[in-house]
Amino acid sequence: KELKVTQPEKSVSVAAGDSTVLNCTLTSLLPVGPIKWYRGVGQSRLLIYSFTGEHFPRVTNVSDATKRNNMDFSIRISNVTPEDAGTYYCVKFQKGPSEPDTEIQSGGGTEVYVLAKPS
């Protein structure tokens, strides 16, 4: 099946201090390689989460990514702060032959708006 990375929500709004879920699904796990979430684009983009076993504070996977047929790579960001605002991209990589993995497809992005906490 042809690989497609889908981020269904163009934007989400969340109150500061709350949690939000950023959805991402794939149509294929091939070619093999990791899935990562970034905020922003280009050289300055920030790695938010990687499905490769590392620990990321405040960010967790929603589904059981250890299922060998898992296609859901959604994440939950907890205790959101204004600094978390921005556009988040779910990115599929192809493993590299003894070199850095190659980005092969990105979702369309989900913009996160952080609302002031109601007083």
């Epitope: 091939l30 070619p31 093999v32 499905f51 490769t52 059981d64 250890t66 060998r68 493993k95």
Partner: antibody, heavy 118, light 107 residues
Framework: DVQLVESGGGVVRPGESLRLSCAAS????????MSWVRQAPGKGLEWLAG????????YYIDSVKGRFTISRDNSKNSLYLQMNSLTAEDTAVYYC???????????WGLGTLVTVSS | ALTQPASVSANPGETVKITCSGG??????YGWYQQKSPGSAPVTVI????KRPSDIPSRFSGSASGSAATLTITGVRVEDEAVYYC???????????FGAGTTLTVL
């Protein structure tokens, strides 16, 4: 330190059953997929079965499908392998192994010996 | 099936390369496992093609290209004498496979 300790091996007759256990410590067991691998006397390593972190998804090599069942109890940090209808060909050292994110292995137990003999 | 040589030998200080072929680079990740004696616990020396666990010496390295993976031991030592198994995880079939093992003899 990550530690995996298998138990439950022993001598059984052909056709009998055995349940192996693997006690895990030193890591968040409920976050990792796990596998069972065996080694028959004088032979190489053979992957048998794997299970997802939550326990809902299981995977088997064809030769044990229907006879062996992998399961886990995350509340007890334990992995299991139920083996039914054992034959002499199942005689081996059985290892549990922790899986990496891409379903290879990073940590192994010391193994437990299963002998099937009449 | 993954294919690796039955045996290799080297003198201390030499570089040893053990190959493992038969996987599909598009769908396979490789790992390498060291077993010093039959029935003893395997030790992971490489996983994810080229990732070395923190407690494994830097003389061990891994690579994968095309349909093959390679374990390289640079400056082999007597204590590296063991059987080395390659393994593959196939993302098409969700199945793990081991090679038959390569016996490394350090002369």
């Amino acid at each position: 330190d990550v530690q995996l300790v298998e138990s439950g091996g022993g001598v059984v007759r052909p056709g009998e059953s055995l349940r192996l256990s693997c006690a895990a410590s030193g890591f968040t067991f409920s976050s990792y997929a796990m596998s069972w691998v065996r080694q028959a006397p004088g032979k190489g390593l053979e992957w048998l079965a794997g299970i997802s972190a939550g326990g809902s998804d299981t995977y088997y090599i064809d030769s044990v499908k229907g006879r062996f069942t992998i399961s886990r109890d995350n509340s007890k940090n334990s992995l299991y392998l139920q083996m039914n209808s054992l034959t002499a060909e199942d005689t081996a050292v059985y290892y549990c192994a922790r899986e990496t994110w891409n379903h290879l292995f990073d940590y192994w137990g010391l193994g437990t010996l299963v002998t099937v003999s009449s | 099936a993954l294919t690796q040589p039955a045996s290799v030998s080297a003198n201390p200080g030499e570089t040893v390369k053990i190959t493992c072929s038969g996987g599909d680079w598009y769908s396979t990740y490789y790992g390498w496992y060291q077993q010093k004696s039959p029935g003893s616990a395997p030790v992971t020396v490489i996983h994810s093609d080229d990732k070395r666990p923190s407690d494994i010496p830097s003389r061990f390295s891994g690579s994968a290209s095309g349909s093959a993976a390679t374990l390289t031991i640079t400056g082999v030592r007597v204590e590296d004498e063991a059987v080395y198994y390659c393994a593959g995880y196939d993302g098409r079939t969700y199945i793990n496979t081991f090679g038959a093992g390569t016996t490394l003899t350090v002369l």
